[in-house]
């Protein structure tokens, strides 16, 4: 499945927004930092072909979107920003799903894919009790918002490189 | 199949040092988290600690840290939960147990092990 | 910590009877309710999780509801087998906590 020349423009658009959305310095929350444990060798671009990779990139979108399109998250962030960033989201979820559908069946290696699917889930879900623990405040969200940055960045290089290899 | 296979019972004096065992296989150990549950005699359950074998990323019970400790081998995909003064009030069952993960992120306890009784007496 | 409260903490039944037990949170966890039984002298067997949705292998005749603080277990036609004790967990908070249990006898 190839996915559309816009799937690529919305991903580095989304990536702008979360920049954009930012509403304090870093710096003030360092007490906040948390490593989330972002399983980068599970959505590394080097060791998953494309067929694994369509869902793995589908499942992150999703829990980013889970993340902010949350009422706690509206409360948090500049409403247009927040609206353009999850709208972008869609789009590429809706890409990536419409890449799953012409792929059912053609799993190469379930478990793999089974276990880089979990992966990605324990890594938002830590995020999410993060949250709660933290009760939403606006440094959690700031802590959050960049290390979904770092989850994003990831998802566009493994496009990036899905696009060359066809 | 999923197995979650733990070590015999054990007796030991108050004092002393214990580690327990839990075997699983059947599934990509890295894949899902592990936690340890207590069950005193006659009593209810009482979750102990979590584990995620990818990383060894663990969540304590207040009620349990520092007395108690996880760890995980991934050569052997075998996870420890170790004492090292056991006093007569850890007398119970401990089970180990697989959570699954949902897409909507609730996590639930999926498959047990068989428990192992731990008695400690003077 | 979040208190599960399971009522009644024992309840007598015969054969064939429909039982309902009940467990409420002390603040909201959402779905995260879970149901386990435990026949004597074996370990917990998971048969609800997130509130409705039964365990793969659990018989139909076991169902849960609800959501927010309140949860319920409603096991119809019963079966030998389900004399036992249920228990209701959540997994919204830490430390997880599990309901104290409701043991179910023959009448």
């Known amino acids: 499945c190839d996915l559309p020349q816009t799937h690529n423009l919305r991903n580095k658009r989304a990536l702008t927004l979360l920049v954009q959305m930012r509403r304090l310095s870093p710096l003030s929350c360092l007490k906040d930092r948390k490593d989330f444990g972002f399983p980068q060798e599970k959505v590394d671009a080097q060791q998953i072909k494309k067929a694994q990779a369509i869902p793995v990139l589908s499942e992150l979108t999703q829990q980013i979107l889970n993340i902010f399109t949350s009422k706690d998250s509206s409360a948090a962030w500049n409403t247009t920003l927040l609206d353009s960033f999850c709208n972008d989201l869609h789009q590429q979820l809706n890409d990536l799903q419409g890449c799953l559908m012409q792929q059912v069946g053609v799993q190469e290696f379930p478990l793999t894919q089974e276990d880089a699917l979990l992966a990605v889930r324990k890594y938002f879900h830590r995020i999410t009790v993060y949250l709660r623990e933290k009760k939403h405040s606006p440094c959690a969200w700031e802590v959050v918002r960049a290390e979904v940055w770092r989850a994003l960045s990831s998802s566009a290089n493994v496009l990036g490189r899905l696009r060359e290899e066809k | 199949e999923v197995q979650l296979v733990q070590a015999g019972a054990e007796v030991k004096a108050p004092g002393e040092s214990l580690r327990i065992s839990c075997k699983v296989s059947g599934y990509t150990f890295t894949s899902y988290w592990i936690s340890w549950v207590r069950q005193i005699p006659g009593k209810g359950l009482e979750w102990m600690v979590k584990i995620d074998p990818r990383d060894s990323y663990t969540i304590y019970n207040p009620s349990f840290q520092g007395h108690v400790s996880i760890s995980v081998d991934k050569s052997i995909t075998t996870v420890y939960l170790q004492w090292s003064s056991l006093q007569a009030s850890d007398t119970a069952i401990y089970y180990c147990?697989?959570?699954?993960?949902?897409?909507?992120?609730?996590?639930?306890?999926?498959?047990w092990g068989q428990g192992t009784l731990v008695a400690v007496s003077s | 910590d979040i208190q599960m409260t399971q009522s009644p903490s024992s309840l007598s039944a015969s054969v064939g009877d429909s039982v309902t037990i009940t467990c409420r949170a002390s603040?909201?966890?959402?779905?995260?309710f879970h149901w386990y039984r435990q026949k004597p002298g074996k370990a917990p067997e998971l048969l609800i999780y997130?509130?409705?949705n039964l365990q793969t292998g659990v018989p139909s005749r076991f169902t849960g509801s609800g959501s927010g603080t309140e949860c319920t277990l409603t096991i119809t036609s019963l079966q030998p087998d389900d004399f036992a004790t249920y228990y209701c967990q959540q997994t919204h908070g830490y430390p997880f906590t599990f309901g104290q249990g409701t043991k179910l006898d023959v009448r």
């Open positions: 147990v697989r959570h699954y993960l949902t897409q909507s992120l609730v996590d639930y306890f999926d498959h």
């Open positions: 997130s509130a409705s």
């Open positions: 603040q909201s966890v959402s779905n995260y």
